[in-house]
Interface confidence: medium
């Protein structure tokens, strides 16, 4: 046992020696005047008046007695609906924003430690953001009968709509509902228009063939609380084969009447490749010959992203309102109340000051609404189907599908840099810069109003 | 401010015609829609059709199908409504209302979006007696 | 198409009274439900559209809930000036219809 003792003794020993010698000793504890041309350490601030390194107040606390000399910083817990993020000596706690109203829901309640963040609640999007949450929410348009959905609503883009393009319609008036194909008749009772679809009689319809276009399962956004049929195909992986020229199905989702003959077709090729492959095998352990592999590759060609969306024309702007990247943090002013946050950009992390969990407030419309040229949704389906037959007579089959499917999309995901935090220096200890809408607007790009004008030159067909 | 003015009442006789005119003023007629609606007498609101008046596409209510006529005058911001081979049922207060309304930007005839019958005509009576 | 029933036919109250008013659908709407208000001899005026977004111009005692196929109209606090027919409409699909309509009389 002496052995441990001796050990144990010793890792003490050196552990008081090591911060003996990380801090010398006439600065161990808070009051302490710094040694010239050195700064505070973490979680401590310099007090210009005592001119003393003094302790900061944690997380959910504020200085309720500034620290002298003699004496630290006394610090008392933030009283209801207020609260501070970070570790501060700011003499009143921050006030929680406003209730969310009655078009948002709160994601993250006010507590001693954190403000209260309201997002847009589903079928609305953020038409106006803050540092965090939104500041003014707006429904997402609806596009009536005779216009489909272009580009889907995210949380931070409104819903753009199109007219039906011949050979399709869309008889709602919604959201989230694209143009679909027409049904094709033997013969057709009622033609089908941009808000109709086509009435057959009595014999059993076919869905039209819309070129290249392949009806893919829609992913679950994890990003965006309101869910939402996409016009683009999506990337989720599919066990479905997709087939460069099958007929597309309504997009609303029956692909019943889709999967069943494809399943048909797959089955009996596969049977087929199966059969040629076996009696292959027997033909040629029979004439003692080397054995087989046959592979076969059926591949299915990258489908262009405009064919497999429907062309997207130039309706495709961006019209976000984006709030400007804001890194400073809400404690930036002890006086107030009312979001206080002015973005401050490319000023270096002060040392020993803990990092705001903020981060950066992005406007981003996440995959769905990247650039323009963005949407370049790639999908990739291979079957591959090897036969081989081996030496002893009993003939080795198999076959392997693959499924593939890439998504050049890519969603903007900076992280932020250079983060500045408020109170690392004596020179920016109470800085009050106010958060105005006109900042917030700084964008060139306008978002329409519900109702606009439309340009000059633009005259009825 | 935004109004829409429809033409006077009408007397027509059972298989004749009538076309409803309705003004409007206020605003830019070309980037809404117009909606026509009926009330028979004593009676409920009836949805008849709708014409974008950027392009002049229509939506008729089935039951009408065939015997309704919407129709726009651009130069006049004016829509037309007319209806054909009347019958005594036909008798009904019509309304004109504007009904939806494109996006602005360059591309504002690719925008469509629904807003509700938001400006009402003061209605037209067509009384429809032999 | 979808029809739309309204409940209750006809409602008599007092002035300051709640008044609330509903709407069935015969399938499923989302949210595409508006609520209208026609005073005798005048043209039909939008109350509420999508369900349960207000109108500018349109006092604040009138507001509507709902999606799917159940909504309602509610009249918070009545006034004189409130007696009319209201009817709900939906623009779900097409034909666009309306709801057979609820008289409100002041007692």
């Known amino acids: 046992m002496a052995p441990v003792a001796v050990w144990a003794a010793l890792a003490v020993g050196l552990e008081l020696w090591a911060a003996a010698h990380a801090l010398p000793a006439q600065v161990a504890f808070t009051p302490y005047a710094p040694e010239p041309g050195s700064t505070c350490r973490l979680r401590e601030y310099y007090d210009q008046t005592a001119q003393m390194c003094c302790s900061k107040c944690s997380p959910g606390q504020h200085a309720k007695v500034f620290c002298t000399k003699t004496s630290d910083t006394v610090c008392d817990s933030c009283e209801d609906s207020t609260y501070t993020q970070l570790w501060n000596w700011v003499p009143e706690c921050l006030s929680c924003g406003s209730r969310c109203s009655s078009d948002q829901v709160e994601t993250q309640a006010c507590t001693r430690e954190q403000n209260r963040i309201c997002t847009c609640r589903p079928g609305w999007y953020c038409a106006l953001s803050k540092q965090e949450g939104c500041r003014l929410c707006a429904p997402l348009r609806k596009c009536r009968p005779g216009f489909g959905v272009a580009r889907p609503g995210t949380e931070t883009s409104d819903v753009v709509c199109k007219p039906c393009a011949p050979g399709t319609f869309s008889n709602t008036t919604s959201s989230t509902d694209i143009c679909r194909p027409h049904q094709i008749c033997n013969v057709v009772a009622i033609p089908g228009n941009a808000s109709m679809d086509a009435v057959c009689t009595s014999t059993s319809p076919t869905r039209s063939m819309a070129p290249g276009a392949v009806h893919l399962p829609q992913p679950v956004s994890t990003r965006s609380q309101h869910t939402q049929p996409t016009p683009e195909p999506s990337t989720a992986p599919s066990t479905s084969f997709l087939l460069p020229m099958g007929p597309s199905p309504p997009a609303e989702g029956s692909t019943g009447d889709f999967a069943l003959p494809v399943g048909l077709i797959v089955g009996v090729t596969a049977l087929g490749l199966l059969i040629i492959g076996v009696v292959n095998c027997v033909i040629m352990t029979q004439v003692k010959k080397k054995p087989l592999c046959l592979q076969r590759e059926a591949k299915v060609p990258h489908l262009p992203a405009d064919k497999a969306r429907g062309t997207q024309g130039p309706e495709q702007q961006h019209l976000l309102i984006t709030a400007p990247s804001s890194s400073s943090s809400s404690l930036e002013s002890s006086a107030s109340a009312l979001d206080r946050r002015a973005p401050t950009r490319n000023q270096p992390q002060a040392p020993g000051v803990e990092a705001s969990g903020a981060g950066e407030a992005r406007a981003s419309t996440g995959s769905s609404d990247s650039s323009p040229g963005g949407h370049g949704t790639q999908v990739n389906v291979t079957c591959i189907v090897n036969v081989c037959s081996s030496s002893d007579h009993s003939s080795q089959c198999s076959s392997q599908a693959s499924s593939t499917m890439g998504d050049t999309d890519s969603s903007p995901s900076e992280s932020p840099k250079d983060e500045q935090v408020p109170f690392s220096k004596e020179e920016c200890a109470f800085r009050s810069q106010l958060e105005t809408p006109e900042t917030l607007l700084g964008s060139t790009e306008e978002k329409p109003l519900p109702l606009g004008v439309p340009d000059a030159g633009m005259k009825p067909s | 401010q935004v109004q829409l003015v429809q033409s006077g009442p009408e007397v027509k006789k059972p298989g004749a015609s009538v076309k409803v005119s309705c003004k409007a003023s206020?605003?830019?007629?070309?980037?809404?829609?117009i909606s026509w609606v009926r009330q028979a007498p004593g009676q409920g609101l009836e949805w008849m059709g709708w014409?974008?008046?950027?392009?002049?596409?229509?939506n008729y209510a089935q039951k009408l199908q065939g015997r309704v006529t919407m129709t726009t005058d651009t130069s006049t911001s004016t829509a037309y409504m007319e209806l054909r081979s009347l019958r005594s049922d036909d008798t009904a207060v019509y309304y004109c209302?504007?009904?939806?309304?494109?996006?602005?930007?360059?591309?504002?005839?690719?925008?469509?979006?629904?807003?509700?019958?938001?400006?009402w005509g003061q209605g037209t009576t067509v009384t429809v007696s032999s | 198409e979808i029809v739309l029933t309204q409940s209750p036919d006809f409602q008599s109250m007092t002035p300051e009274e709640k008044v609330t008013i509903t709407c069935r659908a015969s399938?499923?709407?989302?949210?595409?439900l508006h609520w209208y208000q026609q005073k005798p001899d005048q043209s039909p005026k939008l109350l509420i559209k999508?369900?349960?977004q207000s109108i500018s111009g349109v006092p604040s005692r009138f507001s509507g809930s709902g999606s799917g196929t159940d909504f309602t109209l509610t009249i918070n606090s009545l006034e004189a000036e409130d007696a009319a027919t209201y009817y709900c409409?939906?623009?779900?699909?097409?034909?666009?219809?309306f709801g057979p309509g609820t008289k409100v009389d002041i007692k």
């Open positions: 014409i974008n008046a950027y392009n002049g596409n229509t």
């Open positions: 206020g605003y830019t007629f070309t980037n809404y829609g």
């Open positions: 999508f369900a349960s």
């Open positions: 209302a504007r009904d939806g309304g494109y996006g602005s930007g360059t591309y504002h005839n690719d925008y469509y979006y629904y807003y509700g019958m938001d400006v």
């Open positions: 399938q499923s709407i989302g949210s595409n």
């Open positions: 409409h939906q623009s779900s699909s097409l034909p666009f219809t």
